[in-house]
């Protein structure tokens, strides 16, 4: 018969013959023959392999490294990698997460869009007319302005994206 | 910095228990397996088994399985070891370990004495 | 379980001189560790994943092997050099230890 020019899924082309790949968890040893099946061999402690694969070494888990503010958010398994985040009020400084970064605070005349997570910043967004804030904040939104007609009062000094309006009394009207 | 610190030396008569504890710093106890290890005077390093502290899920070598018990506290970050009816072969340095990747020191405790004499 | 062997168990080296320590397992193992050990200290981690050098670890220290065959090698022998080294499996229960090379300086 032809030798083999694909082979199914789960399995690999090698001196012209189909071997299995090794299941996720494991390393290939060696490759299969006319007579033998592949040798696969469990990754040991600490490493993994996540797919089905013909690798002849497992990969390390990775390491949370506490000293970039890293910590773990799910440990590795033999087919799976460690999962990091970062400690409260910090966040991942890449897709990969290998080190963390202060979130970032939103200045006066800006609101907290979105809070940060452990794996995005915080998103800041100016605040609107009839909005303020005067604080830099990682939490904090922009307020709405007073309404000083609802408390019977008059705006003696109009808000700006930074401040709140001052309400003071009505003139009395003279006799 | 990460640390494994663990309990003073203990001296024991035979037939009685001990309880050795392993309190880590600069990581939490829950994300890595603890080993415990034991070396007897003058002899190598033998492993004796290891603990997942996160769900207590353990592995013991069948030689001290009956004989060592582990388990840890979260809340404290410790790891303990007891070790049961006690004889004068019970008698070593028992340390506790990390994975070996933690920070790729691979972490060890000082080392406690287990003296069982009559 | 896996049993491993070193070989050495006691050797002794002159300064310079290149140094090889064997550890071999009764099957395939995924990786080797190695520790060094001094007397009235806790091991150190030497040499993980087979061939990777722990912190700290001098760069004349070496290590190798694949499936049931291991080896550290120590390019050119110092003084502080002169330990216990032993191998370790991680990858079958019960995880187990070679029985120490014991290597003196002449």
């Known amino acids: 018969p032809e030798p083999p020019t694909a082979c199914r899924e789960k399995q690999y082309l090698i001196n012209s013959q189909c071997c299995s790949l090794c299941q996720p968890g494991q390393k290939l040893v060696s490759d299969c023959t006319e007579f033998t099946e592949t040798e696969c061999l469990p990754c040991g402690e600490s490493e993994f392999l996540d797919t089905w694969n013909r690798e002849t070494h497992c990969h390390q888990h990775k390491y949370c490294d506490p000293n970039l503010g890293l910590r773990v958010q799910q440990k590795g398994t033999s087919e799976t990698d460690t999962i990091c985040t970062c400690e409260e009020g910090w966040h991942c400084t890449s897709e990969a997460c290998e080190s963390c970064v202060l979130h970032r605070s939103c200045s006066p005349g800006f609101g907290v869009k979105q809070i940060a997570t452990g794996v995005s910043d915080t998103i800041c967004e100016p605040c609107p007319v009839g909005f303020f804030s005067n604080v830099s904040s990682a939490f904090e939104k922009c307020h709405p302005w007073t309404s000083c007609e609802t408390k019977d009062l008059v705006v003696q000094q109009a808000g700006t994206n930074k401040t709140d309006v001052v309400c003071g009394p009505q003139d009395r009207l003279r006799a | 910095e990460v640390q494994l610190v663990q309990s003073g030396a203990e001296v024991k008569k035979p037939g009685a228990t001990v309880k050795i504890s392993c309190t880590v710093s600069g990581f939490n106890i829950k994300d890595y397996y603890i080993h415990w290890v034991k070396q007897a005077p003058g002899k190598g390093l033998e492993w004796m088994g290891r603990?997942?502290?996160?769900?207590?899920?353990?592995k013991y070598d069948p030689k001290f399985q009956g004989k060592a018990t582990m388990t840890a506290d979260t809340s404290t970050d410790t790891a303990y070891m007891e070790l049961s009816s006690l004889r004068s072969e019970d008698t070593a340095v028992y340390y506790c370990?990390?994975?070996?990747?933690?920070?790729?020191?691979?972490?060890w405790g000082q080392g406690t004495t287990v003296t069982v004499s009559s | 379980q896996i049993v491993l062997t070193q070989s050495p168990t006691i050797m002794s080296a002159s300064p310079g001189e290149k140094v090889i320590i064997t550890c071999s397992a009764t099957?395939?193992?995924?990786?080797i560790l190695w520790f060094q050990q001094k007397p009235g200290t806790s091991p150190k981690l030497w040499i993980y994943?087979?061939?990777n050098l722990a912190s700290g670890v001098p760069a004349r220290f070496s290590g190798s092997g694949s499936g049931a065959s291991y080896s550290l090698t120590i390019s050119r022998m110092e003084a502080e050099d002169a330990a216990t080294y032993y191998c370790q499996q991680r990858t079958f229960y019960p995880y187990t230890f070679g029985g120490g090379t014991k290597l003196e300086i002449k």
């Open positions: 099957s395939s193992v995924s990786y």
């Open positions: 370990t990390t994975s070996y990747y933690v920070g790729t020191y691979g972490y």
């Open positions: 603990i997942d502290p996160e769900d207590g899920d353990t």
């Open positions: 994943s087979t061939s």
